[in-house]
Interface confidence: low
């Protein structure tokens, strides 16, 4: 139903912690150079006006549009041209072309420093002074990272962040409790960032009809005793709150969202029985875990998919009379029958089935043409399967480190021409899925892998398209979504590229290398890796493990030195010229 | 060419019991979930019970629940249901189903329950 005053109705529906707390990341995630200060203070200043509203919705500009009283307070802040250079143009724009041309210049790589984690007892004291204000830099500070970070859930994350914080921090070892938490809560949000971005992605570039068709297929695997139409409702929702945080309207999404959540609760019986320990969690929590729910048991008794999409006599006709019902009917019954599956590997498969019915529901014999269909889907199957085997084995074999150096040297020879710290944060998040995927059950492997690495491969495509550089990255981030992981799999050595001369000043190292964190000094070793395979992109695996050992050695030989500078001084150049020798 | 055969079925007194068979062929049975269907005369088709492809979870209607038992020997192709305590509303021809349908697509075996 229309509200007077959108503001004072989200204000209502979402409670001022709640509210304030996605005011804040919407301005963060539009302007991502700001202070914390200078949102703050914008916050506060919606937020006043909103209390204002929900006193008096007919009070002067309570019923204008959510877009509008924000985009006016971004467009008043001071000094926004030589801040933000042409960003500050889309202020002379009306809305809705404001709010567009704002969401155009989000920026997935912004030139600021990483988020450093303050040390235990300055972050508890901090804490303890101010909650609200420490939770606020947290979200302003991930927001302004990640400004397509799903705004709710990022919500959620700063609960836990809370709940950590108020636990460890009245512990004697607050760094020993803390460390492993806070550690725990930025690996899950930084995999719900490259999530959320490839949603949104798919959203931007192929409309809301392909991401109606992704959540069709993942809420079918989730809720396989759930009917079509369910489903489809279930779709239609989590599609509107997705376009909405993608499009900047947190409020509403954030709204949207609680709604969604409340519905699945109230329609259990219809869904999934295995939603009540998530429905009696609070607001936060229960939207995250219901989207993060274990699959609900599989019928005992679905028959053959052939019967309907194959057998059936009347298939070109209920496909000509229906097309997206027909194949939305088919992506739920082949989805719910599959959870050992990947959404990605559901959707080739559908596609493929709607490219076979496009051809043979044209011939004079269709039953004929399309009778092996099924038959046709092994190969689709069989690729990302054997994908899986291959590079878990590996991973098995080599451990996250290697696997991820592994991974590095491969994608390397793909795209040469792609910065190497890009390549390196390719590499490293690639290689994660190791730790994440390969040691699930044999039937939770694939949707793992495949759908991980789909996103992680839509953020370097993203990172691409600011200076696309490489013809083989292009291509393959040019296709449809779903095509993009087995495309980047294909790819072999790149012929056309020129290999970067020797420079040596790429290979010499100082002794502050040794006080290092791990992290950092494995980036390090990783950014020499991917140089070396630049100079020599057809270097065998050998050779290469040969030079990364003796670096290794090097390294380990000069930090444990009394004289460290000496050694990096003198042992450095011996090193260069031992890395030539073996890669000539 | 599916193929779903049914035997076994008879005329028995009310407490009697009965077993039926369903020979499968023209598909993997192993694949696949199974069910048992029966029709009363002048009445729609009834979901009686169901078998997953491993055997493993069965499932019942609540007006044969603790008298009938399905199972399936999945090497001779074959699908069963073992009914006890036969009452005269069990009187139907019952035939079986890959999955869950109740669209008929065998002769199907006729048990009558009569004193």
């Known amino acids: 139903e229309a509200h007077k005053s959108e503001i004072a109705h989200r204000y209502n529906d979402l409670g001022e912690q709640h509210f304030k707390g996605l005011v804040l990341i919407a301005f963060s995630q539009y302007l991502q150079k700001c202070s914390y200060d200078e949102h703050a203070k914008l916050v506060q200043e919606v937020t006043d006006f909103a209390k204002t509203c929900v006193a008096d919705e007919s009070a002067a500009n309570c019923d204008k549009s959510l877009h509008t009283l924000f985009g006016d307070k971004l467009c008043a802040i001071p000094n926004l041209r030589e801040n933000y250079g042409e960003l500050a143009d889309c202020c002379t724009k009306q809305e809705p072309e404001r709010n567009e041309c704002f969401l155009q210049h989000k920026d997935d790589n912004p030139s600021l420093p990483p988020f450093e984690r303050p040390e235990a007892e300055a972050m508890c004291t901090s804490f303890k002074e101010n909650p609200t204000t420490f939770m606020g830099h947290y979200l302003h500070e991930v927001a302004r990272r990640h400004p397509y970070f799903y705004a709710p859930e990022l919500l959620y994350y700063a609960e836990q962040y809370n709940e950590i914080l108020t636990q460890c921090c009245a512990e004697a070892d607050k760094e020993s409790c803390l460390t492993p938490k806070l550690d725990g809560v930025k690996e899950k949000a930084l995999v719900s960032s490259v999530r959320q971005r490839m949603k949104c992605s798919s959203m931007q570039k192929f409309g809301e009809r392909a991401f109606k068709a992704w959540a069709v297929a993942r809420l079918s695997q989730t809720f396989p005793n759930a009917d079509f139409a369910e489903i489809t409702k279930l779709a239609t929702d989590l599609t509107k709150v997705n376009k909405e945080c993608c499009h900047g309207d947190l409020l509403e999404c954030a709204d949207d969202r609680a709604e969604l959540a409340k519905y699945m609760c109230e329609n259990q019986a219809t869904i999934s029985s295995k939603l009540q320990t998530c429905c009696d969690k609070p607001l936060l929590k229960k939207a995250h875990c219901l989207s993060e729910v274990e699959h609900d048991t599989m019928p005992a008794d679905l028959p053959a998919i052939a019967a309907d999409f194959v057998e059936d006599q009347e298939v070109c006709k209920n496909y000509a009379e229906a097309k997206d019902v027909f194949l939305g009917t088919f992506l739920y019954e082949y989805s719910r029958r599959h959870p050992d599956y990947s959404v990605s590997l559901l959707l080739r498969l559908a596609k493929k089935y709607e490219a076979t019915l496009e051809k043979c529901c044209a011939e004079a014999n269709p039953p004929a043409c399309y009778g092996t269909v099924l038959a046709e889907f092994q190969p689709l199957v069989e690729e990302p399967k054997n994908l899986v085997k291959t590079n878990c084995d590996l991973y098995e074999k080599l451990g996250e480190y290697g696997f991820q150096n592994a991974i590095l040297v491969r994608y390397t020879q793909k795209a040469p021409q792609v910065s190497t710290p890009t390549l390196v944060e390719a590499a490293r998040n690639l290689g994660r899925v190791g730790t994440k995927c390969c040691t699930l059950p044999e039937d939770q492997r694939l949707p793992c892998v495949e759908d991980y690495l789909s996103a992680i491969l839509n953020r370097v495509c993203l990172l691409h398209e600011k200076t696309p550089v490489s013809e083989h990255v292009t291509k393959c981030c040019s296709g449809s979504l779903v095509e993009r992981r087995p495309c980047f799999s294909a790819l072999t050595v790149d012929e056309t590229y020129v290999p970067k001369e020797f420079k040596a000043e790429t290979f010499t190292f100082h002794s502050d290398i040794c006080t290092l964190p791990e992290k950092e000094k494995q980036i390090k070793k990783q950014t020499a890796l991917a140089e070396l395979v630049k100079h020599k992109p057809k270097a065998t695996a050998e050779q290469l493990k040969t030079v990364m050992d003796d670096f290794a050695q090097f390294l380990d030989t000069c930090c444990k030195a009394a004289d460290k500078d000496t050694c990096f001084s003198t042992e450095g150049p011996n090193l260069v010229t031992r890395c030539k020798d073996a890669l000539a | 060419q599916v193929q779903l055969v049914e035997s076994g079925g008879g005329l028995v007194q009310p407490g009697g019991s009965l077993r039926l068979s369903c020979a499968a062929s023209?598909?993997?049975?192993?694949?696949?979930?199974m069910s048992w269907v029966r029709q009363a005369p002048g009445k729609g088709p009834e979901w009686v019970s169901a078998i997953d492809s491993g055997g493993a979870d069965t499932r019942y209607a609540e007006s044969v629940k603790g008298r009938f038992t399905i199972s399936r020997d999945n090497a001779k192709k074959t699908l069963y249901l073992q009914m006890n305590s036969l009452k005269p509303e069990d009187t139907a021809v019952y035939y079986c189903?890959?999955?869950?349908?109740?669209?008929?697509g065998s002769q199907g075996t006729q048990v009558t329950v009569s004193s």
């Open positions: 023209g598909f993997t049975f192993g694949s696949f979930g």
């Open positions: 189903t890959i999955g869950q349908s109740t669209s008929r």
